[in-house]
Interface confidence: low
């Protein structure tokens, strides 16, 4: 499988572009929109019929260091009576995001972009029934 | 990746902070290249809070294509297949990091950008807004 390349050949390179060594790219990690505060519908993770918990993963050699992962609390979904209905399934919803990975090689350090899969929350689905022949 | 020499006092100079600007390899290391959520699962159709997926394309961004979820209903689908308006379908949103070409149109110069995407929908008990 080919690893995707970020650079696009169809872009016309303006004169103002900074010089970059071959095979690499310049990345400013001062994040645009860094200070935007976000809150979804209040307590969505506990009000959902497919509730979930959050776990924070931390890695000092990753930027950002903190990545929050969701985990579905149940296999089934919560019905109107507050009981788990195992005829339905709680399933994770996932989204890819980019991180910068710092790698140490002796007294040198290198930086690598990495795609990570984040579980964002859960949704309740009708199960696919696999009939055994 | 591209290696950058560290300070002369290398063993004692473990920098806990990332520098503001880094040189990174053009290749992205990843294990998941399937960026079309329609191909990865059919949850968007099978969910009790189903959603449609809209393609958002921006050539100045990497990835240039991002799929945005929009809940199909205000309510949720009940066991009879009807919409139950005592419950709410709400989008699950996530901040993700993408690359923005900076300066614009430059092939190999980027800045990280935080964007908000709706990934899917979930069914929740509603918050009732009482009108005074």
């Amino acid at each position: 499988r080919k690893i995707p390349k970020v650079g696009h050949t169809f872009f016309q390179k303006p004169e103002s572009c900074p010089p970059v060594p071959g095979g690499s790219m310049k990345l400013d990690i001062g994040i645009i929109n860094e200070n935007q505060r976000v809150s979804m519908s209040r307590n969505i993770e506990s009000r959902s019929t497919s509730p979930w918990n959050y776990t924070v993963t931390w890695d000092p050699n990753r930027y950002p260091s903190e990545v929050v992962q969701a985990q579905c609390r149940n296999l089934g979904c919560i019905n109107a009576q507050g009981k788990e209905d195992i005829s339905m399934n709680s399933v994770p919803i996932q989204q890819e995001t980019l991180v910068v990975r710092r790698k140490h090689q002796g007294c040198s350090v290198s930086f690598q972009l990495e795609k990570v899969l984040v579980t964002v929350g859960c949704t309740c689905v009708t199960p696919v029934i696999h009939h055994v022949q | 990746g591209i290696t950058i020499p560290r300070n002369p006092g290398c063993p004692n100079s473990e920098d806990k902070n990332f520098p503001r600007t880094v040189m990174v390899n053009l290749n992205i290391h990843n294990r998941n290249t399937n960026t079309n959520p329609k191909r990865s699962s059919d949850y968007y159709n099978r969910s009790t809070s189903p959603w449609n997926l809209h393609r958002n394309e921006d050539p100045e961004r990497y990835p240039s294509v991002i799929w945005e979820a929009k809940c199909r209903h205000l309510g949720c689908i009940n066991a009879d297949g009807n919409v139950d308006y005592h419950m709410n379908s709400v989008p699950i949103q996530q901040e993700i990091l993408v690359l923005r070409r900076e300066p614009p149109h430059c092939p190999n110069s980027f800045r990280l950008e935080k964007i908000l995407v709706s990934v899917g929908c979930t069914c929740v008990t509603p918050i009732v807004h009482h009108v005074a």
Partner: nanobody, 124 residues
Framework: EVQLVESGGGLVQPGGSLRLSCAAS????????MGWYRQAPGKQRELVAL???????DYADSVKGRFTISRDNSKNTVYLQMNSLRPEDTAVYYC??????????????????WGQGTLVTVSS
């Protein structure tokens, strides 16, 4: 915060027409869904029509072909054109919207909001 204000209700004869409008105001970032529900005396609130951000619409079977929902995104307004009205269409019509908005520096991605309702009476 967000406010939904309906207008256009009133008394109309069977077979007549009315146009309801609902304007959303406040620190709105995006409107995922806007639409109309109605509640007749002694009955549960029911869907009339919804219009989604992409422009697609969803109607209750009882109003299909008679009612048309439309939206003006620039004004954050939704309209309900009601033709061939029947006595059974008599109800309080509520505007509803699923809205992402700012409040106190925080972005709320999705909250269901309701208007106070406008009365539509179909009677001869």
């Amino acid at each position: 915060e967000v406010q939904l204000v309906e207008s256009g209700g009133g008394l109309v004869q069977p077979g007549g027409s009315l146009r309801l409008s609902c304007a959303a105001s406040g620190t709105i970032v995006n409107i995922h869904v806007m639409g109309w529900y109605r509640q007749a005396p002694g009955k549960q609130r029911e869907l009339v029509a919804l219009i989604f951000s992409g422009g697609s619409a969803d109607y209750a079977d009882s109003v299909k072909g008679r009612f048309t929902i439309s939206r003006d995104n620039s004004k954050n307004t939704v309209y309900l054109q009601m033709n061939s009205l029947r006595p059974e269409d008599t109800a309080v019509y509520y505007c509803a919207a699923e809205i992402g908005y700012y409040s106190g520096g925080t972005y709320y991605s999705s909250e269901a909001h309701w208007g106070q309702g406008t009365l539509v009476t179909v009677s001869s």
